[in-house]
Interface confidence: medium
């Protein structure tokens, strides 16, 4: 099943101590999915979308080994035929650097 969209959402972090907010969204025909956020291949957080929503926002507190950095990926799972869990492809990566680049 298709990969989710992933993006960093405001307010953007400006230092290691700031929280990171990462939104992850499944395609329109997969509301209520279970989402997993990975950092460098390690599971950071699990969230389930409400049944009428296609995505979640992961809120990561600053100052911990599980927070700033990256690359972050997300993935979602849905129940398919015969109630078997199906996992999506991984999203594109999102990297977070400090301070947030201004190009």
């Amino acid at each position: 099943i298709p990969a989710p969209s992933i993006r960093l959402v405001p307010p953007y972090p400006s230092s290691q101590e700031d929280p990171i907010h990462i939104a992850c969204m499944a395609p329109g025909n997969f509301p209520g999915a279970n989402f997993t956020l990975y950092r460098g291949g390690q599971v950071v957080q699990l969230l389930q979308a409400p049944t009428d929503q296609r995505g979640v926002t992961f809120n990561l507190s600053g100052g911990s080994s599980k927070a700033p950095g990256g690359p972050f990926h997300c993935q979602y799972g849905v129940l398919g035929e015969l109630n078997q869990s199906q996992l999506s492809d991984l999203s594109e990566p999102v990297n977070v650097s400090f301070p947030v680049p201004t190009w």
């Epitope: 993006r7 959402v9 969204m25 329109g28 009428d52 929503q53 296609r54 995505g55 809120n59 201004t102």
Partner: antibody, heavy 127, light 107 residues
Framework: EVQLVQSGAEVKKPGESLKISCKGS????????IHWVRQMPGKGLEWMGI????????RYSPSFQGQVTISADKSISTAYLQWSSLKASDTAMYYC????????????????????WGQGTLVTVSS | DIQMTQSPSSLSASVGDRVTITCRAS??????LAWYQQKPGKAPKLLIY???NLQSGVPSRFSGSGSGTDFTLTISSLQPEDFATYYC?????????FGQGTKVEIK
């Protein structure tokens, strides 16, 4: 087929109220946000505001805050834009558009461009 | 509000020409930028989202690039149906804002 169908053109007098509509079909209405965009005659596009039909979360551009109200009735897959007291300067084409959205904490985030648009509703306000 | 400045405001070109339109944001918007095409009397049409992703069904002669504050829409070989007005739009921050538009006319 995804469609957004807007209500027909309106001619109103200054001070009158108005509510125009945007009906979605061909997709799950509560899974996408609805944006409203104004285009005054011969001018560019102006983003007015947004509604998440699933939970009626709204955000307005400061330019339109307090001037219009955006609402939705998910039971009939319809979003609305309304004025309580029209002005001549409200004369414009108004478009609704579908966009990916996500509700996060106390704020909402848009996730991409507006992939489907209504045909537009022309509102003319003249005495 | 984030200001979006497009240039040029209008241009004249011939069929087959390579056309480039630029859009500059007043502050960083990462890659959260879309491009639209609008023809007279019609609703806008999404061409590009996330700065460089081609919307389904849009011809591959359209492409987008850029990140941060500076973005470009390129039409590699202008076709007769491409004469229209083009708008950029940022969706990094509320309120979402559009550029003022670039009108592409026949030379």
């Amino acid at each position: 087929e995804v469609q957004l169908v807007q209500s027909g053109a309106e001619v109103k007098k200054p001070g009158e109220s108005l509510k125009i509509s945007c009906k979605g079909s061909g997709y799950s209405f509560t899974n996408y946000w609805i944006h409203w965009v104004r285009q005054m005659p011969g001018k560019g596009l102006e983003w007015m505001g947004i509604i998440d039909p699933g939970n009626s979360f709204t955000r307005y551009s400061p330019s339109f805050q307090g001037q219009v109200t955006i609402s939705a009735d998910k039971s009939i897959s319809t979003a609305y834009l309304q004025w309580s007291s029209l002005k001549a300067s409200d004369t414009a084409m108004y478009y609704c558009a579908r966009g990916d959205g996500l509700y996060g904490g106390s704020d909402g985030y848009s996730m991409g461009g507006f992939d489907n648009w209504g045909q537009g509703t022309l509102v003319t306000v003249s005495s | 509000d984030i200001q979006m400045t497009q240039s040029p405001s209008s241009l004249s070109a011939s069929v087959g020409d390579r056309v480039t339109i630029t859009c500059r944001a007043s502050q960083t918007i990462w890659n959260y930028l879309a491009w639209y095409q609008q023809k007279p009397g019609k609703a806008p049409k999404l061409l590009i989202y996330d700065a460089s992703n081609l919307q389904s069904g849009v011809p591959s002669r359209f492409s987008g690039s850029g990140s941060g504050t500076d973005f470009t829409l390129t039409i590699s070989s202008l076709q007769p149906e491409d004469f229209a007005t083009y708008y950029c739009q940022q969706y990094s921050h509320f309120p979402h804002t559009f550029g003022q538009g670039t009108k592409v006319e026949i030379k």
